[in-house]
Amino acid sequence: DSSKWVFEHPETLYAWEGACVWIPCTYRALDGDLESFILFHNPEYNKNTSKFDGTRLYESTKDGKVPSEQKRVQFLGDKNKNCTLSIHPVHLNDSGQLGLRMESKTEKWMERIHLNVSERPFPPHIQLPPEIQESQEVTLTCLLNFSCYGYPIQLQWLLEGVPMRQAAVTSTSLTIKSVFTRSELKFSPQWSHHGKIVTCQLQDADGKFLSNDTVQLNVKHTPKLEIKVTPSDAIVREGDSVTMTCEVSSSNPEYTTVSWLKDGTSLKKQNTFTLNLREVTKDQSGKYCCQVSNDVGPGRSEEVFLQVQYAPEPSTVQILHSPAVEGSQVEFLCMSLANPLPTNYTWYHNGKEMQGRTEEKVHIPKILPWHAGTYSCVAENILGTGQRGPGAELDVQYPPKKVTTVIQNPMPIREGDTVTLSCNYNSSNPSVTRYEWKPHGAWEEPSLGVLKIQNVGWDNTTIACAACNSWCSWASPVALNVQYAPRDVRVRKIKPLSEIHSGNSVSLQCDFSSSHPKEVQFFWEKNGRLLGKESQLNFDSISPEDAGSYSCWVNNSIGQTASKAWTLEVLYAPRRLRVSMSPGDQVMEGKSATLTCESDANPPVSHYTWFDWNNQSLPYHSQKLRLEPVKVQHSGAYWCQGTNSVGKGRSPLSTLTVYYSPETIGRR
């Protein structure tokens, strides 16, 4: 109720002689701060004096002074909430009741705490899970109702007296709720741990033994078995007898059933610890074991491999791979059931023994067409020789052999002819299904392996064919050797390298790209007139009159071809310059007079300069010089100069006469 002081602390604390006790404690006074605190041992209330009697272990006064003999007992609390105590060392006669007498300004309270001090260190307590099964991880717990800051301890785990190598986790609690030290060990027990003793040992800080607790492990496990066989090597021949015995070395709980298994399958009506096999056959070869069950589950023995030996059975041949491609590798495998395994093999190709081949596998690194046929084998072991089986067929496939392209036409072939070619071959596996031709063209194939080229081109130099099954084999190209008239005839200027100027030495070449046959004749022509019959046309000193359109022709036995017309352009400086006057060379003053500089030039005149009779240049640069209105003073001789990229030319003087008008004459 509200008239009580509120305390929190463990109800009872445990310790042993010479150890210490640490008492975690909290409180809340009814009013104000704590003014006086007395720790009694086994306090008794005296009704006469209305006070408590008993041994005073600790006393604090208002002035805060503590008697020097109270060093063993320490009040670690404060004036309003902490009442923690420490007794170090603690003695056997400290057992009993501790009384905490608390006084504030107006209120008093006695709080009781039980202290249990034993003569010797008390043992910890081991806690185990209700059931332990083999290989299932469990947690072992060792608990000691003791912990004190002034007295360090440790808990160690032992198995059959030997420290356990698994890491334990130790935890301590010193709280108002509980005081303990705990060690937890995670452990995966095996069936062999069944019945073994586990110890939790309490030690002081130096590892000195203080006390311990022990438990015996009860590890549930499936039966553990051993199998024995006669004969011990488990190798027999057909008709022999075999005995197998099953022994249980451990089972927890006790076993309930027994059975035998061959190759993982249970043998019917075999439920005893002995298995007797009489007059064994090869089919009884296999892996045997016994199985014994208990409530945990079935346990199995190790397997015994029983081998029943017999002579090889009729063999079969496996080919990797058929059909085989010529040049590839092939492996033959002789398959025959036998025990022991065959030690010798005899191989046959098309019924004939293959010399030097005695292994299970025959490897041919590079297959050739003649390797095709039937392969069979015979296997042999210590018990006898097997029969030869039916064998396997090897099919060797290869591209068509000895492919040739044949021209069916009479030679020579001329441009424009129709040419027929055929594609021949010697042998093929599988059969030829199609043909290819190089180069590709819009040609017809009237029948398989025949090519017809209509209007053969001059540049159809070579043709090759391929006969194809799964692969194509190409024949060597065959030359058509097509004859044709000269091609790409053109006129080429050899010299000069730059433009042609009047007076230059000029050479023109008649070029053509090809001709078959090679023997040719040349013809040069200008404006329909024959000029020469050489490959070159030469001019020692070209003149403007040589300019014009030139063509050359090239002939062979097939035909003749003309070049495109080629224009010969001769560049020359302005020539034949003259000044013409309009309307004439006599003009009345005030009218208009136009002087024109006429010339012959290639390229045309680009710049004109006009001069008077004094050779004074006039600031006019056009072909025409217009004088308007013309003055009498303009009478005189004029000349012009024309310039192009080749050079200059000048005209002779031309005289302009400007006469007075009737008006001027009348004024005079």
């Epitope: 710049h607 300069t609 008077d612 004094n614 050779n615 004074q616 240049s617 006039l618 600031p619 006019y620 640069h621 056009s622 217009r626 004088l627 308007e628 209105p629 013309v630 003055k631 009498v632 003073q633 303009h634 310039t643």
Partner: antibody
Framework: EVKLVESGGGLVLPGGSLKISCAAS????????MYWIRQTPDKRLEWVAY????????FYPDSVKGRFTVSRDNAKNTLYLQMSRLQSEDTAMYYC???????????WGQGTSVTVSS | QPVLTQSSSASFSLGASAKLTCTLS???????IGWYQQQPLKPPKYVME???????HTGDGIPDRFSGSSSGADRYLSISNIQPEDEATYIC?????????????FGGGTKVTVLG
């Protein structure tokens, strides 16, 4: 009456550019060759550009070649002088003039002043 | 290129006759020149075109007092009965084409002062 009127002059920084114009009237502009002539502060006359009636031929003295460009628009009866990379020595009064029939300039404009200074 | 030489100034009494000279460099002695008049604060004005034989073409609005003549490389501009409005600078000029490049050169000008 033949009339030539220049415009576009002004103050320009060294290295700068300026385009001046000359509007012609009173004659058939497309028949005549035209000049630009400048008069320096010391009153000397210097020919700076010459263009044919069609605009096909142009001539310049070495002092302005590559910096000045003369052009004409016969449809607008206008003569132009584009001046670039101007120098202080280009400071002058710029006149346009018509070339007479043979040897001389028979009509001159009033001029436009160009000052090149920083 | 041709070079034109003129005396820098000349003074004449009102009503007197004046004769100004423009000399061409010797190899250009037959060349025709142009005479121009520039009154103060005005543009140059065409006076006449003068040939080496003395024949000339005179500009519009030029009074009959102005005439021209030639002697060798010298070209003369004559003014009879000189008037105050004739006070001006008189400049000669000549054009030429060298290596297909046209050029035009001016003389330094003669400054004419009319006294009285």
């Amino acid at each position: 009456e033949v009339k030539l009127v220049e415009s576009g002059g002004g103050l320009v920084l060294p290295g700068g550019s300026l385009k001046i114009s000359c509007a012609a009237s009173g004659f058939t502009f497309s028949d005549y060759y035209m000049y630009w002539i400048r008069q320096t502060p010391d009153k000397r006359l210097e020919w700076v550009a010459y263009i044919s009636n069609t605009g096909y031929s142009t001539f310049y003295p070495d002092s302005v070649k590559g910096r000045f460009t003369v052009s004409r628009d016969n449809a607008k009866n206008t003569l132009y002088l584009q001046m670039s990379r101007l120098q202080s020595e280009d400071t002058a009064m710029y006149y346009c003039a018509r070339h007479g029939i043979l040897y001389a300039m028979d009509y001159w404009g009033q001029g436009t002043s160009v000052t090149v200074s920083s | 290129q041709p070079v034109l030489t003129q005396s820098s100034s000349a003074s004449f009494s009102l009503g007197a006759s004046a004769k100004l000279t423009c000399t061409l460099s010797s190899q250009y002695s037959t060349y025709t020149i142009g005479w121009y008049q520039q009154q103060p604060l005005k543009p140059p004005k065409y006076v006449m075109e003068l040939k080496h034989d003395g024949s000339r073409h005179t500009g519009d609005g030029i009074p009959d007092r102005f005439s021209g003549s030639s002697s060798g490389a010298d070209r003369y501009l004559s003014i009879s009965n000189i008037q105050p409005e004739d006070e001006a600078t008189y400049i000669c000029g000549v054009g030429d084409t060298i290596k297909e490049q046209f050029m035009y050169v001016f003389g330094g000008g003669t400054k004419v002062t009319v006294l009285g």
